[in-house]
Structures are given as structure tokens and as C-alpha cells.
């Protein structure tokens, strides 16, 4: 049976999967696939690690935790309804039929539609869907995607809004640039 996880369209989905390395650096291969875990391997592989590194991945799929520590949780970026379905996390432990298999059901809900704000007081309201959840689990630290173009009249307001905000750090860390003009 699979365990169900939920995300909204436009958000990042988080599918947790872990194992305990036998010893530090003694990693085992892991694969993530779309569809329930088959008898061997993963079907429709979206990401794979070996004993040293992530050796295969497709766009929008990445490991946010440190896989060298056994955190092989999958993040799917900017999900759509088409991302719904069952995902397989397979810990490929050496030996016959030793693999650990986890079937995770991802349910994507339509994005909540919020009315346009009358005053653009905060950054998320001013630039909807610019913030995506990135990190370990739901309601995690938020990082910025690409910044929209911002004209001169918005600059000072935006700067004031950001000054005491944690978003200021995220802006800096994201390497986003503000274009004037």
C-alpha cells in the first residue's frame, strides 16, 4: 500500500525517503521512478544515485537533503496536475531481494485562487507564485524564483518592504537582479 502526500499546482512537492548508511560514506544506490515499485529497479526513472553521486536526474526532480547522510527525499519542482500518481523510492541494498521499496502517492490539488490585493503590501501579494517551497518538508524555508521586471516607481517601496524581511537574504542568495527602467 502507498502513503499519500499532497501538494498544490505551482508548489514544490516533497516525497520523503531515507535510509541509514551502514557506515559513513558507505552509500547504496537509490532510484526514484514514476509508477509503483516493480520487482526490480524503478520504472520511468526520474532520478538515480550510485555509491558516490547523483548520476542521473531529469529536470524539476532533485534531492534537497544530503543523500550522503541517507536523506534521499525527492523534491519535484513547480508541480502540475500531470505529476499526480505513484512514485517509487527504491533503496538498492546489496543482496538478493534486499531492496527497501516505498510507494508514495502524490496528489496534486488545483492552486487556490486568491483575489488580487487592493494594496501591494507584501512581497508575495505583489508577485504571486514567485515563492516556491524548497526544502525539507511542507511549509519550509522559502526561496525566490526568477524576479519579474520591476520599474523605478516600485523600487523604493520594494526595498522598504524587504529591508526587515528574511526575503532580503533569499533575494541575495538567489542571485536575482533588479532591472531598472
Amino acid at each position: 500500500s502507498e502513503v499519500e502526500y499532497r501538494a498544490e499546482v505551482g508548489q514544490n512537492a516533497y516525497l520523503p525517503c531515507f535510509y541509514t548508511p551502514a557506515a559513513p560514506g558507505n552509500l547504496v544506490p537509490v532510484c526514484w521512478g514514476k509508477g509503483a515499485c516493480p520487482v526490480f529497479e524503478c520504472g520511468n526513472v526520474v532520478l538515480r544515485t550510485d555509491e558516490r553521486d547523483v548520476n542521473y536526474w531529469t529536470s524539476r526532480y532533485w534531492l534537497n537533503g544530503d543523500f550522503r547522510k541517507g536523506d534521499v527525499s525527492l523534491t519535484i519542482e513547480n508541480v502540475t496536475l500531470a505529476d499526480s500518481g505513484i512514485y517509487c523510492c527504491r533503496i538498492q541494498i546489496p543482496g538478493i531481494m534486499n531492496d527497501e521499496k516505498f510507494n508514495l502517492k502524490l496528489v496534486i490539488k488545483p492552486a487556490k485562487v486568491t483575489p488580487a490585493p487592493t494594496r501591494q503590501r507584501d512581497f508575495t501579494a505583489a508577485f504571486p507564485r514567485m515563492l516556491t517551497t524548497r526544502g525539507h518538508g511542507p511549509a519550509e524555508t522559502q526561496t525566490l524564483g526568477s524576479l519579474p521586471d520591476i520599474n523605478l516607481t516600485q523600487i523604493s517601496t520594494l526595498a522598504n518592504e524587504l529591508r526587515d524581511s528574511r526575503l532580503a537574504n533569499d533575494l541575495r542568495d538567489s542571485g536575482a537582479t533588479i532591472r531598472i527602467g
Partner: antibody, heavy 117, light 107 residues
Framework: EVQLQQSGAELVKPGASVKLSCTAS????????MHWVHQRTEKGLEWIGR????????KYAPKFQGKATITADTSSNTAYLQLSSLTSEDTAVYYC??????????WGQGTTLTVSS | DIQMNQSPSSLSASLGDTITITCHAS??????LSWYQQKPGNIPKLLIY???NLHTGVPSRFSGSGSGTGFTLNISSLQPEDIATYYC?????????FGGGTKLEIK
């Protein structure tokens, strides 16, 4: 043998800051997440946050954001917890713990922090 | 945040009894749950990880089960040394959270 040795008891005044240490032996902290958990007298366990000593990245419980700062020094195999603007509410036992990766398999002996004027 | 609702908060049982402690997660945590024992004046000690795996050196009288949102810790043939407070913990998502604890006393 894996051990986590924490610094000794602290008695500090309200408004002050304190830095607690947790020195690991028997393993390299770079290979594990290091966490801090606190426990008030006769109360339950509460997770403060963690650090990945390999890259210095941290996670905090919302309640401790701005109050706690977790750092690590891999050369001395030590994790630190700094607590600022202390009040009597911060009086508690503070534990460091190693996770592997989603459960705590080893704990320090605890550091008692007393905030009193 | 994922809330961990642990019950009962206290429990009194006789030596030799079998007792059950339950933990309910506010959202699915699959099997990423562990149980800890804290004896009076001592540090917490890992009993069970991944919902049902017994940690090295823990007596087989302890067992865990569950998946998704509902979990149980069973202690069979209760011994005097089992007097302690027991905590569940979810390690799936940050911020990590613990149950409120169950204080076990012997009648």
C-alpha cells in the same frame, strides 16, 4: 565508541547570551546531521534545530528562529548552540544529538542552563 | 508543522503486564517515526526507529508498529526498569516534532 560530550552547567542573567558546546568522539560530525533539543523541568522534549556540519546549513523550529544559532567547527568536531536575549523561559536542559538521518541514535549528557538575576 | 499527539499522558500498570502507547501524526509520516525512553534524571535513549525496527541492545519486550498517521509502542511483560517517560518523534519533515510523552508508573 561514539560519544557526545557537552559543556558544563551555566547560570546567566536575563538579557545575556550563552554558547553551549557539544564535542563528538568516535565519529566525524561531517557525516551526520547534528541537532539540539531542549527540555524544561518536568516537561517534554522540544526540537530546536539542526546543522549539516559539512556545509553549515541549518534548520530551526519557528519558535527558536532568532533565539537560537547553531554552528559547527569540523576541525574540533564540535557543534555549538548560541542562545540570545535570555529569559527565565529559557531555563532548561539542552541536549545535542546525532541523527541517522531521521532518528536520534546518540545523545549528549545534557547541559543545564539557568537564567536568573 | 506536523503535530504528534501521544496518549495516554500517564499510565499505571503492574509488573508483567503488557502496555500500549499510541502516537497520532497530524499528517502522514509514512514510517519515519521513532520512540525514545527517558528514565528519571537520565538522557533520552532510542528504542525503535522506522516505526518498528528495534535499536541495538533494546530488549525484545519492546515493539513498535504503524504507518502513515497511527503508531503504537508495546511493552510486554513489564519490568521495574521500564519506569520512564516515553516519547514518539517524527523525522520526516522539519521542524521535527515530539509527542507530549507518556509517563509510565508501576502499580
Amino acid at each position: 565508541e561514539v560519544q557526545l560530550q557537552q559543556s558544563g552547567a551555566e547560570l546567566v542573567k536575563p538579557g545575556a547570551s550563552v554558547k553551549l558546546s557539544c564535542t563528538a568522539s568516535g565519529f566525524n560530525i561531517k557525516d551526520f546531521y547534528m541537532h539540539w533539543v531542549h527540555q524544561r523541568t518536568e516537561k517534554g522534549l522540544e526540537w530546536i534545530g539542526r546543522i549539516d556540519p559539512e556545509d553549515g546549513k541549518t534548520k530551526y523550529a519557528p519558535k527558536f528562529q532568532g533565539k537560537a544559532t547553531i554552528t559547527a567547527d569540523t576541525s574540533s568536531n564540535t557543534a555549538y548552540l548560541q542562545l540570545s536575549s535570555l529569559t527565565s523561559e529559557d531555563t532548561a536542559v539542552y541536549y545535542c544529538a546525532r541523527s541517522n538521518p531521521y532518528f536520534f541514535d546518540y545523545w549528549g549528557q545534557g547541559t543545564t542552563l539557568t537564567v536568573s538575576s | 508543522d506536523i503535530q504528534m499527539n501521544q496518549s495516554p499522558s500517564s499510565l499505571s500498570a503492574s509488573l508483567g503486564d503488557t502496555i500500549t502507547i499510541t502516537c497520532h501524526a497530524s499528517q502522514t509520516i509514512n514510517v519515519w517515526l521513532s520512540w525514545y525512553q527517558q528514565k528519571p534524571g537520565n538522557i533520552p535513549k532510542l528504542l525503535i526507529y522506522k516505526a518498528s525496527n528495534l535499536h541495538t541492545g533494546v530488549p525484545s519486550r519492546f515493539s513498535g508498529s504503524g504507518s502513515g498517521t497511527g503508531f503504537t509502542l508495546n511493552i510486554s511483560s513489564l519490568q521495574p526498569e521500564d519506569i520512564a517517560t516515553y516519547y514518539c518523534h517524527q523525522g520526516q519533515s522539519y521542524p521535527y516534532t515530539f509527542g507530549g510523552g507518556t509517563k509510565l508508573e508501576i502499580k
